[in-house]
Interface confidence: low
């Protein structure tokens, strides 16, 4: 590391004095300091001498000596004060440019360290600093305005108290430039537009930036439109707005509209599509199947997508039967808007009851007329089973009725002993009835089937069980012949309550 003689951090001299600063290093050394007159420089290899015979206030500053060949890049410094009673300040630059939120150094160097206690920073013509101006002072470097703001772009003077009066420096102009983060921000309204031929339309393209230097234009398909520009400044941003007003739209106005803005940082663009139609339209659709099957007690959301222009004048969900005359609760109907012309309407049917099976219709109306979309909702039920003993054409017959949806399959089991339910070990015989007789099969209702098992003689120490199953579940009924007649057992667990 080079060494400076005199080996003091600060040196205070009077105007006109001779000052000699000597720097010695291992290799060649170089001086660096404020640009000022009257210095002469002598070098002889490993030492360098900076000297003046007539020091002035302009020689005030920090002089640094470096050794270019030093890999550690070490340096030494000495600060020189030339204390001129008439000149308390040495201003190194009269214009300082920084970006917003950077620290701005106003380089007015104090020529006499004794004056430090009475220094202040003011705006020209003695005006006070703006509120919230946060600054600090260093006698070696000057005033620093911390995190400078655009609004602090002003002319400043450094003030020192000398003999009871304030002595000002020459002025320093601070320019705080806005940081332009990127191309201007854009909005194009609306994001999508539909109009009937002959209607009026408006498209607004606006761009904003922290800096006033940017351009904006609106183009239709690939043609730049000549539209007067409105300019504004608010929220610390410059705004430029282009408004396209069309009194009576026609098909040639349809197409792609792009809003484009550019500045030194680059270009932004956003687009929208304008559709011109001959007349009002209203389209209903659903991603769901219009025929729905749901297990009783479960929930279902019916969802309808609506595309319409002009907007809907009315809409509702209606239950068309065939059961009760109840109507869907309004609180279960939910409407969401995907965008201006597309909406989704949802009917929530939680914990479906038997009386809620049937047809649900969504109706909507706009100036284009009425449209309806109807869902058919069938409920699935696990089978319910009952068995009776009867005589048909003189033959003893077990008659099993099973009711559920989808249509239940029927299986008969004969097993040893008296039991509520045949288990595998007890089973003597199994008969599948592939074609049970359908007794009733109305839309939205359970399907009831009947299966007959002709039994010549009932074995009294045996159980006859009818089992029915479908995709939802199963049910069974055990028939136990006893000497005093017949005895039937629905299994205890089969108490079906939807």
């Amino acid at each position: 590391i080079p060494v400076i003689e005199p080996s003091v951090p600060e040196l205070v001299v009077k105007p006109g004095a001779t000052v000699t600063l000597r720097c010695v290093g291992n290799g060649s050394v170089e001086w660096d300091g404020p640009p000022s007159p009257h210095w002469t420089l002598y070098s002889d290899g490993s030492s360098s001498i900076l000297s003046t015979n007539n020091a002035t206030f302009q020689n005030t500053g920090t002089y640094r000596c470096t050794e270019p060949g030093d890999p550690l890049g070490g340096s030494a410094a000495i600060h020189l004060y030339v204390k001129d009673p008439a000149r308390p300040w040495n201003v190194l630059a009269q214009e300082v440019v920084v970006f917003e939120d950077q620290d701005a150094l106003l380089p007015c160097l104090l020529t006499d360290p004794v004056l430090e206690a009475g220094v202040s920073l003011v705006r020209v013509r003695g005006r006070p600093l703006m509120r919230h101006t946060n600054y600090s002072f260093s006698p070696w470097h000057g005033f620093t305005i911390h995190r400078a703001k655009f609004i602090q772009s002003q002319d400043y003077q450094c003030s020192a108290l000398m003999g009871g009066r304030k002595v000002m420096s020459i002025s320093i102009r601070l320019k705080v430039q806005k940081v332009i983060p990127g191309p201007p921000a854009l909005t194009l309204v609306p994001a999508e537009l539909v109009r009937i031929r002959g209607e009026a339309a408006q498209i607004v393209c606006s761009a904003s930036s922290v800096d006033v230097n940017f351009d904006v234009f609106l183009q239709h398909n690939n043609t730049k439109l000549a539209i007067p520009q409105q300019s504004d400044f608010h929220n610390n941003r410059y705004q430029k707005v282009l408004t396209l007003n069309l009194d009576q739209v026609d098909f040639q106005h349809a197409g792609n509209y792009s809003c484009v803005a550019s500045n030194v940082q680059g270009k932004h663009s956003t687009s929208m599509f304008f559709r011109v139609v001959e007349s009002a339209y209203l389209n209903l659709s659903s991603e769901q199947n219009l025929i729905q099957e749901v297990t009783v007690g479960e929930g279902l959301n019916l969802k309808v997508m609506v595309e319409a222009y002009p907007g809907l004048q009315g809409f509702n969900w209606t239950y068309l039967g065939p059961f009760s005359d109840h109507q869907p609760e309004p609180k279960l109907a939910n409407a969401t808007t995907k965008d201006t012309y597309r909406h989704t309407f949802t009917l929530s049917l939680p914990r479906l009851k038997p009386s809620e099976a049937g047809r649900y219709s969504f109706l909507a109306r706009n100036p284009g007329g009425w449209r309806a979309l109807t869902f058919e909702l069938t409920l699935r039920y696990p089978p319910e089973v009952s068995v009776i003993w009867t005589f048909i054409n003189g033959s003893g017959t077990l008659l099993c009725a099973a009711s559920g949806y989808p249509q239940p399959n029927v299986t008969w089991l004969q097993c040893s002993g008296h039991t509520d339910r045949c288990d595998e070990a007890q089973v003597l015989q199994v008969w599948d009835d592939p074609y049970p007789e359908v007794l009733s099969q109305e839309p939205f209702h359970k399907v009831t089937v009947q299966s007959l098992l002709t039994v010549e003689t009932l074995e009294h120490n045996q159980t006859y069980e009818c089992r029915a199953h479908n995709s939802v579940g199963s049910g069974s009924w055990a028939f136990i012949p006893i000497s005093a007649g017949a005895h039937t057992h629905p299994p205890d667990e089969f108490l079906f309550t939807p």
């Epitope: 991603e287 939910n334 969401t336 808007t337 995907k338 989704t344 949802t346």
Partner: antibody, heavy 120, light 112 residues
Framework: EVQLVESGGGLVKPGGSLRLSCAAS????????MNWVRQAPGKGLEWVSS????????YYADSVKGRFTISRDNAKNSLFLQMNSLRAEDTAVYYC?????????????WGQGTLVTVSS | DIVMTQSPLSLPVTPGEPASISCRSS???????????LDWYLQKPGQSPQLLIY???NRASGVPDRFSGSGSGTDFTLRISRVEAEDVGVYYC?????????FGQGTKLEIK
């Protein structure tokens, strides 16, 4: 039945990474926004991140911004949370929750949660 | 960020008695569409949270009608008309008006 099942939690060292997954079933996954919420041991609920149905809009809590990435695969009915540069304070049970259809955002249902422990 | 403040933080209740929990937001949760973007959740011991009330007053599917929500703007209340043993847990309010979505600190309901 609507179901959400989280996976991918575990023990990881500070600075490490983990990828959480949430498998959805029983509903049209591509129609709903999805969310991650976490709960540090013995503490309350903290929203972590949300992603819209088509992944066009993504939001993060400040505490995870720049470290966590939410994503989804609508074809596979899956939601993900890639967690990088993990810290001890990220230790929590992470829940995935279905959001509403736009513009409603209530969280229903929630998964059972997966525990993430960040410790050296 | 919108700050959600719940009170009380602990709520001992006798079964069959009513209970109410207050939730206050640092700014209005009323959207221009007329809805308050305030939801209530219950986290039972050892379980995941479950939705109770959405958009300030709408009961979620399967939630008993003894639960009700009310309020508008910045002040909201969850009421339980008759507390049952199965209602124990931590109740949270949450705003979804704007991100970051924020929860209240939670109110622990206990049976006396």
């Amino acid at each position: 039945e609507v179901q959400l099942v989280e996976s991918g939690g575990g023990l990881v060292k500070p600075g490490g990474s983990l990828r959480l997954s949430c498998a959805a079933s029983g509903f049209t996954f591509s129609s709903y926004s999805m969310n991650w919420v976490r709960q540090a041991p013995g503490k309350g609920l903290e929203w972590v991140s949300s992603i819209s149905s088509s992944s066009s809009y993504i939001y993060y809590a400040d505490s995870v911004k720049g470290r966590f990435t939410i994503s989804r695969d609508n074809a596979k009915n899956s939601l993900f949370l890639q967690m990088n540069s993990l810290r001890a304070e990220d230790t929590a049970v992470y829940y995935c929750a279905r959001g509403g259809s736009f513009p409603y955002n209530w969280f229903d249902p929630w998964g059972q949660g997966t525990l993430v422990t960040v410790s050296s | 960020d919108i700050v959600m403040t719940q009170s009380p933080l602990s709520l001992p209740v006798t079964p069959g008695e009513p209970a109410s929990i207050s939730c206050r937001s640092s700014q209005s949760l009323l959207h221009s569409n007329g809805y308050n973007y305030l939801d209530w959740y219950l986290q039972k011991p050892g379980q995941s949270p479950q939705l109770l009330i959405y958009l300030d007053s709408n009961r979620a599917s399967g939630v008993p009608d003894r639960f009700s929500g009310s309020g508008s703007g910045t002040d909201f209340t969850l009421r339980i008309s008759r507390v049952e043993a199965e209602d124990v847990g931590v109740y949270y309010c949450m705003q979804t008006l704007q991100t970051p979505y924020t929860f209240g600190q939670g109110t622990k309901l206990e049976i006396k």
